[in-house]
């Protein structure tokens, strides 16, 4: 049976550039290792982001020289992506593998449509 | 450009073993999850083995479990499968597929034949 | 398991004609993880469209895909000389990972 993954449709990254969101998965089973992968799509063309594998009840822990950093609590995923621009606009997918026990589940969400506003700068100011 | 090249097939008694390899290049091996499929004479494909990111997950078709084993070298972007207790049933060309991004196997070797007689 | 039904098992068409394809699941398959593969005499599988109706790089849009639940569907909009070989179909969203048996696309 398919395993849904629910996130939100669009997010506005903040002047900083980070943008966060949750993605939540309908486990089919008790999973106890989980893999969690945000992708990108642009112009059909996907490409990973990031991606974390952690074990139920530990935290999530992406690899130091990430841009993500998230969290866990049982079946949801609260994402934070850093460091963005607006060029990186586009759709974020959240895809989630219930990597043990048996059987594997895939499950690939609608996708977050996150946009980036670059900040403007600041004028020279003649004080 | 992505290429995945099978080796190691051949003819082999039953009950005798065999290894086969898939060297992977043109992509961050150790991003991808793989798969071996095989397809006997004129039949179908038929799923038989997957691996993990880290080959720390193993999933096999029941046909085979107990006596296949798929394992890689993430230092070596090389994908195996070691088969023991061979069988008639076992012939078949065996592939090594790619997982893409969003689960189908979007790029496959060129395959390697593997025959079981006596 | 997910049990995969494709038919017919042999499609006898001609150029430019439209061919169908149709794939039954045993039970519900999200269309997020249904896959179809074109597959040639002495060739590797290639795959043609994920998540029933995406198409895969490179192929032309002639191709399509559709259905959800447990029905879904190849369609080649106008049959090309080189589109004549074995089409299946694939779940990918579980364990363990199933093909239907293949429709033969052939020159009638």
């Known amino acids: 049976k398919a395993m849904h993954v629910a996130q939100p449709a669009v997010v506005l990254a903040s002047s900083r550039g980070i943008a966060s969101f949750v993605c939540e998965y309908a486990s089919p089973g008790k999973a106890t290792e989980v893999r969690v992968t945000v992708l990108r799509q642009a112009d059909s063309q996907v490409t990973e982001v990031c991606a974390a594998t952690y074990m139920m009840g530990n935290e999530l822990t992406f690899l130091d020289d990430s841009i993500c950093t998230g969290t866990s609590s049982g079946n949801q995923v609260n994402l934070t992506i850093q460091g963005l621009r607006a060029m990186d606009t586009g759709l974020y997918i959240c895809k989630v593998e219930l990597m043990y026990p048996p059987p594997y589940y895939l499950g690939i969400g609608n996708g977050t449509q996150i946009y980036v506003i670059d900040p403007e700068p600041c004028p020279d100011s003649d004080f | 450009q992505v290429q995945l090249v099978e080796s190691g097939g051949g003819v082999v008694q039953p009950g005798r073993s065999l290894r086969l390899s898939c060297a992977a290049s043109?992509?961050?091996?150790?991003?991808?999850?793989m798969h071996w499929v095989r397809q006997a004479p004129g039949k179908g494909l038929e799923w038989v083995t997957f691996?993990?990111?880290?080959?720390?997950?193993?999933y096999y078709c029941d046909s085979v479990k107990g006596r296949f084993t798929i394992s890689r070298d993430n230092s070596k972007n090389t994908l195996y499968l070691q088969m023991n207790s061979l069988r008639a049933e076992d012939t078949a060309i065996y592939y090594c597929?790619?997982?893409?991004?969003?689960?189908?196997?979007?790029?496959w070797g060129q395959g390697t034949l593997v025959t079981v007689s006596s | 398991e997910i049990v995969l039904t494709q038919s017919p098992g042999t499609l006898s068409l001609s150029p430019g004609e439209r061919a169908t394809l149709s794939c039954r699941a045993s039970?519900?398959?999200?269309?997020?993880?249904l896959a179809w593969y074109q597959q040639k005499p002495g060739q590797a599988p290639r795959l043609l469209i994920y998540?029933?109706?995406s198409r895969a790089t490179g192929i032309p849009d002639r191709f399509s895909g559709s259905g959800s639940g447990t029905d879904f569907t190849l369609t080649i909009s106008r049959l090309e000389p080189e589109d004549f070989a074995v089409y299946y179909c694939?779940?990918?969203?579980?364990?363990?990972?199933?093909f239907g048996q293949g429709t033969k696309v052939e020159i009638k």
């Open positions: 039970q519900s398959v999200g269309s997020s993880y």
């Open positions: 597929a790619r997982t893409g991004w969003l689960g189908p196997f979007d790029y």
């Open positions: 691996i993990s990111y880290d080959g720390n997950n193993k």
């Open positions: 998540g029933a109706f």
């Open positions: 694939q779940q990918y969203g579980s364990s363990p990972w199933t």
């Open positions: 043109g992509f961050t091996f150790s991003s991808y999850t």
